[in-house]
């Protein structure tokens, strides 16, 4: 999980105001054991701010200390600020918790830019707008950090929802979700609906806004339209998947599919952008530039550095292409595609926009660590992390931002041969993953 390159992401207002809420289709999947179709208490339990993270309210310790915690499917530690920091309004005070237990072990997590370090312990944890359970979980109490916390983001910690293999300091440190499932009757599954604003929000709007839903232990059918399509989790470390084809406005990028997954492809709620391997990024940008050639933008825009601004309400969405990622299906030789709109990959930037302007950053960027399907992808979809069945489901989100001409889509099946060949096998070495 990277901060800096891997900034946590954007949220916004959930539900109808964000654009058209699509009508629900009636052909639902059959119910599965332990999965109710409605989780009212968990709907709209996420908030956040553009480019800075979706967070959920959690309580830690006895008596409970309330903290906002970034929801991150790209890491596996539950880590919270535990010392004063200029960007933190509050922090975990272990000395005030009667149930805190010190593990007498430190943890140090460096990123490409920045780091955090802390002390490991366990304490009682619950999620007020989640399942009605309390679990004893490992907690990294962050005592020192650099470029980790974000000024004004309103979160004080991070909930790593990926697997133990990438936990720090090592895979013996049980992640929160594993503890939750072991200690309770909560099914081994969670789902995320991240609702991008689609337009810039000022500070007061953000603080009062809703950013989406994390449904712990199930699937809420009100949060998506159409059918859920599942792709296998290739390996349980990150939420690794396999992309088998990429299209820009229906035009195949025509690359060896291994390139799309070099050196992996992951679904990561803690990354803002859709990040693509260098060769894939270059080909995709070339294709997007060609598709949107009626207007020309500076090089810095395509690098995600410069903003492009249009007079309020005049953003020419129609000149930008849709992007489709084909994912390996559950059935041999079958794939499905997820399609996002420019409303997902052009990220509104609220600091600069005025009442006269709507300003956007290009939220597709280059990666040296494989494809990262961050908020740009996830904001189009309801994403089900079905750990029990080692698969990830995608359906069109009921809150995704679109216009009257195009919507995000999840469609299939498509016949795709030799999909296994699309996966990249990372050479097994003693190399640490600490700098991912």
């Amino acid at each position: 999980t990277q901060h800096g390159i891997r900034l946590p992401l954007r949220s916004g207002l959930g539900g109808a105001p964000l654009g058209l809420r699509l009508p629900r289709e009636t052909d639902e999947e059959p119910e599965e054991p332990g999965r109710r179709g409605s989780f009212v208490e968990m709907v709209d339990n996420l908030r956040g701010k553009s480019g800075q993270g979706y967070y959920v309210e959690m309580t830690v310790g006895s008596p409970p200390q309330t903290l906002n915690i970034l929801v991150d499917t790209g890491s596996s530690n539950f880590a919270v600020g535990a010392a004063p920091h200029p960007f933190l309004h509050r922090y975990y005070q272990r000395q005030l918790s009667s149930t805190y237990r010190d593990l007498r072990k430190g943890v140090y997590v460096p990123y490409t830019q920045g780091k955090w370090e802390g002390e490991l312990g366990t304490d009682l944890v619950s999620i007020p707008h989640g399942p009605n359970v309390t679990v004893r979980a490992n907690i990294a109490a962050i005592t020192e950090s650099d470029k980790f916390f974000i000024n004004g983001s309103n979160w004080e910690g991070i909930l790593g929802l990926a697997y133990a293999e990438i936990a720090r300091p090592d895979d013996s440190l049980e992640p929160f979700f594993d503890s939750l499932v072991k200690q309770t009757h909560v099914p081994n599954l969670f789902s995320l609906q991240l609702c991008g604003a689609g337009f810039p929000l000022n500070q007061s709007e953000v603080l009062a806004s809703v950013g989406g839903s994390m449904i712990i232990g199930g699937i809420d059918h009100s949060l998506y339209t159409g059918s859920l399509w599942y792709t296998p989790i290739r390996r349980e470390w990150y939420y690794e998947v396999i992309i088998v084809r990429v299209e820009i406005n229906g035009q195949d990028l025509k690359m060896d599919c291994k390139e799309y997954n070099y050196d992996k492809s992951i679904v990561d709620s803690g990354t803002t952008n859709l990040r693509l391997p260098k060769k894939v990024f270059e080909a995709a940008v070339k294709s997007i530039k060609a598709a949107s050639s009626t207007e020309k933008f500076p090089d810095g825009f395509w690098l995600g550095e410069q903003l492009v601004c249009w007079q309020a309400g005049t953003t020419p969405w129609n000149i930008f292409p849709v992007i489709s990622l084909y994912l390996m299906g559950e059935v041999t030789n079958q794939s499905f595609r997820i399609t996002i709109l420019p409303q997902q990959y052009l990220r509104p930037v609220e600091d600069v926009a005025t009442s006269q302007d709507d300003c956007y950053k290009f939220a597709i960027s280059q990666s040296s660590t494989g494809t990262v399907m961050g908020a740009v992808i996830m904001e189009g979809f309801y994403v089900v992390f079905d750990r029990a069945r080692k698969r990830i489901g995608f359906a069109v989100s009921a809150c995704h931002v679109h216009d009257e001409f195009r919507t995000a889509a999840v469609e299939g099946p498509f016949v795709t041969l030799d999909m296994e060949d699309c996966g990249y096998n990372i050479p097994q070495t003693d190399e640490s993953t600490l700098m991912t």
Epitope: T294, K296, F297, P298, D299, G300, F301, Q306, V352, C359
Partner: antibody, heavy 120, light 108 residues
Amino acid sequence: QLQLQESGPGLVKPSETLSLTCTVSGGSISSSSYYWGWIRQPPGKGLEWIGMIYYSGSTWYNPSLKSRVTISVDTSKNQFSLKLSSVTAADTAVYYCARVGLGVSYFDLWGRGTLVTVSS
Amino acid sequence: EIVLTQSPATLSLSPGERATLSCRASQSVSSYLAWYQQKPGQAPRLLIYDASKRATGIPARFSGSGSGTDFTLTISSLEPEDFAVYYCQQVYTWPPRTFGGGTKVEIK
């Protein structure tokens, strides 16, 4: 080397349309690396960006002037033009044409400028 | 909209002296800032781009620094031809429409 030269009437009556042309010499206006823009400077004041155009015809305008401005390009003549309608005395200024890079997005080359006075 | 504020409005110095001009942005513009020089009766000329890179043909006595919101143009030793008005411009947002109000460097 590439040069820009503005031309057009130096005096325009209030409520009429100001029309200026910028001729590009020593290079092609059809370069894929540049936009071509207009900036003005009222006497004794600062610089105000008016708008710009790409050789394909794609335009960007200053919102405060958008309702009155039209910028067009004639690649066959290697020229681009500015029309500003319903002028008032506040539009009296030196009008500059300039080149804007897409790689380095600054005004890296300017014409000498032409003074346009709005007066009856 | 990002506002650029230049200071001082006027700088009175003698040839050979060091000139330090400031440009402050109302919000971060990263390093997407340029400096232009304008002499009386002439068009502006690009001096510095991307906050610190000298444009072609610009003497080494001109240097730019800063990033985010605070930028500085320094003329290490003023030559007679350097007395002019200097403008900053941000292109963090496209289209590139925002200029500062200018600083006049005059002979003391």
